[in-house]
Amino acid sequence: YDFTNCDFEKIKAAYLSTISKDLITYMSGTKSTEFNNTVSCSNRPHCLTEIQSLTFNPTAGCASLAKEMFAMKTKAALAIWCPGYSETQINATQAMKKARKSKVTTNKCLEQVSQLQGLWRRFNRPLLKQQ
């Protein structure tokens, strides 16, 4: 999906209002310095591409993020403010359902959500030069 035509300011507002709080809740009890940010993004569409991938695509050691509260709200925000997004996700969801495991917060999941927090922070500061 090409995120170029999304309403970035509304997605940012939804993130600041509630999605960010849900990410913090998920990470509660984890030190902010515990994980190094290894995933980066260069502009808002690229950030949303990476956010969508890390949130909804199962990875080795972490197959359960798609059912978390922050994921549900992220899906809603992208569907509402990115034209045509929900229509593109049908195949992705079927694959996700097959890969879904029991909902367990593993260290790998915590690391992945830490990466997500970094991507969202970068999404909110699009004018900053890439480090």
Partner: antibody, heavy 122, light 108 residues
Framework: EVQLVQSGAEVKKPGESLKISCKSS????????INWVRQMPGKGLEWMGQ????????TYNGNFKGQVTISADKSISTAYLQWSSLKASDTAMYYC???????????????WGQGTTVTVSS | EIVMTQSPATLSVSPGERATLSCSVS???????LHWYQQKPGQSPRPWIF???NLASGIPARFSGSGSGTEFTLTISSLQSEDFAVYYC?????????FGGGTKVEIK
């Protein structure tokens, strides 16, 4: 104008099957989660589960998982709640509710259907 | 599961008086994930307050919400006849979504 219109009241016998509906209009149906909420006579509200019509993704309250099935038909902008074998304890009012971001970007159930009364009695 | 406990179950108030409704949450949640709904007999619930303190569209300013963590409050500064109803708090912090048992505000 956003509207959720639910199917009419139902009277059923224990063991029978039932499918009630919630037809949406006035917004992009595929892009918003639809929730189902139960209210037993004289009692409070209980969240049963939700569906994202865009891809059919569902999340259930564990208390209702296996008891009901939530589905949706995008082509007619309608969500469904169904039972394969009703019990007397399923007697209740059932509401569908859309969830979305309000003007302050808080996420909540912002529009509700009028409710469907289901009575199960022998 | 997050348990929402509302008190009192019934609040008897005279028109013009102040009403304070409480919602206690079993584990701390973000204020952005606490909402209030109003329900009148024979009607569907209506969104009333979003994110602890933000009034839904068209809700009069005599209503206010406050709180954080595990304790939240809905206050009606001067009750009008149309305010008599049941009010439910609800959390959108973790699954399953849960509602409080409701507080019925009735005429004294």
């Amino acid at each position: 104008e956003v509207q959720l219109v639910q199917s009419g009241a139902e009277v059923k016998k224990p063991g029978e099957s039932l499918k009630i509906s919630c037809k949406s209009s006035g917004y992009a149906f595929s892009s918003y989660w639809i929730n189902w909420v139960r209210q037993m006579p004289g009692k409070g509200l209980e969240w049963m589960g939700q569906i994202f019509p865009g891809d059919g993704d569902t999340t259930y309250n564990g208390n209702f998982k296996g008891q009901v099935t939530i589905s949706a038909d995008k082509s007619i902008s309608t969500a469904y709640l169904q039972w394969s074998s009703l019990k007397a304890s399923d007697t209740a009012m059932y509401y569908c509710a859309r969830s979305g971001f309000d003007y302050g970007y808080f996420y909540a159930m912002d529009y509700w259907g009028q409710g469907t009364t289901v009575t199960v009695s022998s | 599961e997050i348990v929402m406990t509302q008190s009192p179950a019934t609040l008897s108030v005279s028109p013009g008086e102040r009403a304070t409704l409480s919602c206690s949450v079993s584990s701390s949640i973000s204020s952005s994930n606490l909402h209030w709904y109003q329900q009148k007999p024979g009607q569907s619930p209506r969104p009333w307050i979003f994110g602890t303190s933000n009034l839904a569209s068209g809700i009069p300013a005599r209503f206010s919400g406050s709180g954080s963590g595990t304790e939240f409050t809905l206050t009606i500064s001067s009750l009008q006849s149309e305010d008599f109803a049941v009010y439910y708090c609800q959390q959108w912090s973790s699954y399953p979504l849960t509602f409080g048992g409701g507080t019925k505000v009735e005429i004294k």
